[in-house]
């Protein structure tokens, strides 16, 4: 049987054979991959990149959250959507997950001017069906998925909006475990609206196999702030394996080449 994909830290800490990022298959060896380093001064301003409109993001819900063996994932089940932000159509929210380390400055997937952050949160959306502009795009869309990426840094205050998620982590230490979070809204997790005006945009891929090159990325300039203990909870409470021997951390794909692509900014 073919080995399952994993992160470098899992291969280093476990006896199970698995495929580390440089050996990932599927589309992962192509040339329009994510994540990337964003050189902020090289990104050209594009006036078409306006504000986002969030629908259902403010609704308090009891979300299901699970340990999927690679990250912690909230199931959003089309209960929210986004439009605007220079996107070609409305997009339905599918899931939210995060990437992190057990140390500052190395838990994010994207970097800004070479700087990594403590964590990165991805809200994954799919384009609403029947909204592609032409036949070719409908068959081979490079923007079928819209990911909103939020960098996370340490702040001095507890971020109350994240507490329902942080508190749920204790209930899902092992892969395939799931639980219900205390009632919260997606808006609780986001920075204040005025901080969502500045973002970077490029076309790339999923950062996990099969690394499909069909993602329109939005990386927000302003980071979310979490308290030290909230950040550390992810690496302290979650495990990659059912035996709970390998702490879940460093679930971060290495940076990929930008190549011929361009990054634009709002």
């Amino acid at each position: 049987a073919e080995s399952h994909w994993c992160y470098e830290v899992q291969a280093e800490s476990s006896n199970y054979p698995c495929l580390v990022p440089v050996k990932w298959g599927g589309n992962c060896q192509k040339d329009r991959q994510s994540p990337i380093n964003i050189v902020t001064t090289k990104a050209k301003v594009d006036k078409k990149l306006g504000r986002f409109f969030f629908s259902g993001y403010d609704k308090k819900q009891t979300w299901t959250v699970q340990n999927n063996g690679h990250s912690v994932m909230m199931l959003l089940e089309n209960k929210a959507s986004i439009s605007g932000g220079g996107l070609p159509a409305p997009y339905q929210a599918k899931q939210l997950h995060l990437h992190w380390s057990d140390l500052p400055y190395k838990g994010s997937e994207h970097s800004l001017d070479g700087e990594h952050f403590a964590m990165e949160m991805h809200i994954v959306h799919e384009k609403e069906k029947g909204t592609s502009r032409n036949v070719k795009e409908a068959q081979d869309p490079e923007d079928e998925i819209a990911v909103l990426a939020f960098l996370v840094e340490a702040g001095t205050q507890v971020n109350e909006g994240f507490q329902p998620l942080v508190e749920a982590l204790s209930n899902i230490p092992k892969p395939e475990m799931s639980t219900t979070m205390a009632e919260s809204s997606l808006l609780d997790l986001l920075p204040k609206e005025e901080k969502l005006r500045h973002y970077f945009r490029y076309l790339g891929s999923l950062t996990t196999p099969t690394c499909d090159e069909k993602v329109v990325w939005t990386v927000f300039r302003e980071p979310i702030q979490l308290h030290r203990e909230q950040i550390l909870a992810f690496s302290q409470k979650l495990y990659y394996d059912k035996e709970q021997t390998v702490s879940m951390k460093d679930n971060v794909r290495p940076l990929q080449q930008l190549g011929q692509r361009t990054v634009i900014k709002s």
Epitope: D102, P104, H116, A118, S235, Q236
Partner: antibody, heavy 119, light 107 residues
Framework: DVQLVESGAELVRPGTSMKMSCKAS????????IEWIKQRPGQGLEWIGV????????HYNEKFKDKATLTADKSSSTAYMQLSSLTSDDSAVYFC????????????WGQGTTLTVSS | QIQITQSPAILSVSPGERVSFSCRAS??????IHWYQQRTNGSPRLLIK???ESISGIPSRFSGSGSGTDFTLSINSVESEDIAVYYC?????????FGAGTKLELK
């Protein structure tokens, strides 16, 4: 009372290795990062690296990646730094410090370990 | 990496005088600057965090200000026990870096 107590002064030969310790007390050892800082005589402060005592995760200043190895023993609440292939440039005072917030200031410091490398 | 420049290298003051130390970052770092005092043969002691936030147990004569790239540590009435080297440290981005220090001496 938070305290970081470092091991005593060392005189070692060039080319050898040495390991210094930093024993923490007065707080939950695994909840805070431990940083290591170098200070050469009459000079400023230079960051070496950081360890998360809870997980053993480490991160180094590029300059010290092949010089320093950081470890921690949760059972004794002690952090260690091993320095290898010692030269006279490694003669310095080495401090351990506790990081007050994640990625921020160092709120408590050890008294320092003086290392002299000489033949 | 972010460069931190402290000035002047040496400050000579008389007891009771007000004194200010300057710290400049090579790029904007918000308020992620922290100030330390290191007396001769001692270890650094945290005086001010996040540019202007006071630390429990530190005398109120110590204060800090600034944001972006320019920061100041002030002692409003110098006492003899304040004779030391003062360092600033940025924690905005990795690796954390320190200034070269300003030595405070008595006239």
């Amino acid at each position: 009372d938070v305290q970081l107590v470092e091991s005593g002064a060392e005189l070692v030969r060039p080319g050898t290795s040495m390991k210094m310790s930093c024993k923490a007390s007065g707080y939950a050892f695994t909840n805070y990062l431990i940083e290591w800082i170098k200070q050469r005589p009459g000079q400023g402060l230079e960051w070496i690296g950081v360890i998360n005592p809870g997980s053993g995760g480490t991160h180094y200043n590029e300059k010290f990646k092949d010089k320093a190895t950081l470890t921690a023993d949760k059972s004794s609440s002690t952090a260690y730094m091993q320095l290898s292939s010692l030269t006279s440039d490694d003669s310095a005072v080495y401090f351990c410090a506790r990081e007050g917030d994640y990625a921020s200031r160092f709120d408590y410091w050890g008294q320092g370990t003086t290392l002299t490398v000489s033949s | 990496q972010i460069q931190i420049t402290q000035s002047p290298a040496i400050l000579s003051v008389s007891p009771g005088e007000r004194v200010s130390f300057s710290c400049r970052a090579s790029q904007s770092i918000g308020t992620r600057i922290h100030w330390y005092q290191q007396r001769t043969n001692g270890s650094p002691r945290l005086l001010i965090k996040y540019a202007s936030e006071s630390i429990s147990g530190i005398p109120s004569r110590f204060s800090g200000s600034g944001s972006g790239t320019d920061f100041t540590l002030s002692i409003n009435s110098v006492e003899s026990e304040d004779i030391a080297v003062y360092y600033c440290q940025q924690s905005n981005s990795w690796p954390t870096t320190f200034g070269a220090g300003t030595k405070l001496e008595l006239k």
